[in-house]
């Protein structure tokens, strides 16, 4: 049974097995196609989600289609239901929480009152001034906070308590990526870990250890990653794992908060890594004990410079290390969390290339999240 | 593009009133507070008072309270402002103003051109 | 009311110079302080609000800094457009009041 599973996958109607190697592979081996169902699936950027959070004390703004303009949600006439249309326009399935902040004296955008037309948010055409001066800030999931602080030293073993939303995606029981708890059905990680097998039935998730082997694995019931754009090849380097049963929260199995859409980090800015990747260069051998280092912001111009990266890093990216090199993310991270603190953490980068591990002038690459939360908003809707 | 467009210049008596109008285009009226600032010649500006065109609730300063109405017509997307028992002292340029955003606290992003009104016997 | 004092009550500078007017509160008004410029005959024009953010369309060249009580508008290089007369205004508590004004000639 065993060897059968791991060779043979099994067709129905009529019953007969085929190779595994031919599972997701883009020719249909079994009569009803199902070899071709449980597959890394990609998914479009879509539409713009209407509704966004800022870094200002997590404010809900909300656009105006016929304009394209966004404008901040007064809090005259919030409500309950009002938060939850909110947070559903952006995916989030669990109970929202929120409050009135006051309107600051160097507040932007111009402030609507706030309604529902179809599951929608929209403003309120008949709506008078913003009365309460008061803006709405909104938490759509408890999400970023540790049972520890790490601290802020060079490389050292890490603890599950610090962070508790790191996981280890597994090929066959084997590490492959690192990965980052975002709602008790989603993990965030990276597109590439995915090149080499592409069905979905043999990847598991690992939460809540910092040992590689010593914790459950979670069923996986889709991988989803964006459309390729041959353009730009090591764009989108970004993937969501649903799992198949919903993961329930713990102090060690908690979420990580998604960055705000105006997270701009500006160089020096001191970011988390972790991981159980190799802890040399073609080291050969994963770490089993879950790694962290504290690295900052490097500016993208330094970044792309010709003794670096000449023009490879996008937009859609970042660069983070130390300015002498020597601590970086490597093979076995991939997927992983680049991290920022604030009142939470945040997950601002995803650890996705770069050339060798640790050298001064080629520090990580990672995959931008503030880039694709209009991706991951349309992923978590198609799936709610 | 926002547009105030408000009434032409006044000559009144010691002791009478005068009505100026300020119309509003460019967005939506009652979405956003209304002030009225005036300026004597060769002066400053001293803020008089504040309209909410939603509802027609007013806000005035303590130096004009008795004095001073302000009042709208959303159908016109129109403010007024009318100050009465005049004397010299309130011959000044009159301004309506509304605010950069929607909160009654913040400056004033939005000016009209402005109404001389001429205090004289 | 708060007191908005302004200084100095006029300058005069040339084209391309650094030009500083300041504005003090009679009490904290945190950073709820605007910079308006008027020219003769015109209405006031938005510069600065939340004491240092730029009113979308104003050049680059004005700045404002300051909290509490204290507030500087910078003008780091004077352009002819420039001569105008400045008036800080408090929006942090009721009734909004505006300094006395700088004018700023050509020297």
């Known amino acids: 049974k065993v060897i059968l599973d791991k060779y043979y996958f099994l067709c129905g109607q009529p019953l007969h097995f085929i190779p595994r190697k031919q599972l997701c592979d883009g020719e249909l081996d079994c009569p009803l196609g199902e070899d071709e169902e449980h597959c890394v699936k990609s998914f479009p950027e879509g539409p713009a989600v209407a509704v966004r959070l800022s870094k200002d004390r997590s404010t809900l703004q909300v656009l105006d289609s016929a304009t394209g303009n966004w404008f901040s949600a007064c809090f005259d006439n919030f409500t309950e239901a009002l938060a939850e249309t909110a947070c559903r326009q952006m995916g989030y399935s669990s109970k929202p929480t929120f409050r009135a902040v006051e309107i600051g004296p160097d507040q932007d955008l111009d402030v609507v009152e706030i309604t529902e037309n179809s599951q929608e948010l929209r403003m309120r055409n008949s709506s008078g001034p913003c009365l309460s001066g008061s803006l709405v800030s909104l938490h759509c999931l408890a999400c970023g906070k540790s049972l520890k602080t790490p601290r802020v030293v060079g490389v050292e073993e890490a603890s599950v308590d610090s962070w508790p939303w790191q996981v280890s995606i597994q090929y066959d029981k084997q590490h492959v990526c690192g990965g980052s708890i975002l709602d008790p059905h989603w993990v965030l990680t990276a597109a590439h870990c995915f090149r080499k097998h592409t069905d979905v039935f043999n990847w598991k998730v690992r939460a809540g250890s910092d040992k590689l082997g010593s914790f459950p694995s979670l069923a996986v019931a889709k991988i989803i990653i964006i459309e390729f754009n041959p353009m730009y090849p090591k764009d989108n380097d970004i993937a969501l794992m649903k799992l198949q049963f919903p993961l329930t929260f713990s102090g060690t199995v908690r979420p990580i908060c998604l960055p705000f859409f105006d997270e701009e980090l500006t160089p020096a800015t001191p970011l988390w890594i972790i991981g159980w990747g190799f802890t040399k260069q073609n080291g050969g051998k994963m770490s089993d004990i879950l790694l962290q280092a504290s690295v900052q912001v490097i500016d993208s111009t330094r970044c792309n410079a010709d003794d670096a990266y000449q023009g490879e890093v996008t937009e859609k990216m970042m660069c983070a290390g130390i300015p002498e090199g020597g601590v970086d993310t490597c093979q076995g991270d991939s997927g992983g969390p680049l991290m920022y603190q604030s009142d939470q953490w945040h997950v601002v980068g995803i650890v996705s290339w770069g050339y060798g591990c640790g050298g001064p002038s080629t520090p990580g690459v990672y995959t931008k999240v503030s880039a694709y939360l209009n991706w991951i908003y349309n992923v978590w809707k198609a799936e709610l | 593009q926002v547009q105030l467009v408000q009434s032409g210049a006044e000559v009144k008596k010691p002791g009478a009133s005068v009505k100026v109008s300020c119309k509003a285009s460019?967005?939506?009226?009652?979405?956003?507070?209304m002030h009225w600032v005036r300026q004597a010649p060769g002066q400053g500006l001293e803020w008089m008072g504040i309209?909410?065109?939603?509802?027609?609730?007013?806000s005035y300063a303590q130096k004009f309270q008795g004095r001073v109405t302000m009042t709208r017509d959303t159908s016109t997307s129109t403010v007024y402002m009318e100050l009465s028992s005049l004397r010299s002292e309130d011959t000044a340029v009159y301004y309506c103003?509304?605010?950069?955003?929607?909160?009654?606290?913040?400056?004033?992003?939005?000016w009209g051109q402005g109404t001389l009104v001429t205090v004289s016997s | 009311d708060i007191q908005m004092t302004q200084s100095p009550s006029s300058l005069s500078a040339s084209v391309g110079d650094r030009v500083t007017i300041t504005c003090r509160a009679s009490?904290?008004?945190?950073?709820?302080l605007a910079w308006y410029q008027q020219k003769p005959g015109k209405a006031p024009k938005l510069l600065i609000y939340?004491?240092?953010s730029l009113q979308s369309g104003v050049p680059s060249r004005f700045s404002g800094s300051g909290s509490g009580t204290d507030f500087t508008l910078t003008i780091s290089s004077l352009q002819p457009e420039d001569f105008a007369t400045y008036y800080c205004?408090?929006?942090?508590?009721?009734?909004?009041?505006f300094g006395g004004g700088t004018k700023v000639e050509i020297k």
């Open positions: 939340g004491a240092s």
């Open positions: 309209i909410n065109p939603s509802g027609g609730s007013t």
């Open positions: 103003a509304r605010g950069r955003i929607a909160v009654a606290g913040h400056p004033l992003g939005y």
């Open positions: 460019g967005y939506r009226f009652t979405s956003q507070y």
């Open positions: 205004q408090q929006a942090n508590s009721f009734p909004p009041t």
């Open positions: 009490q904290s008004i945190s950073s709820w």
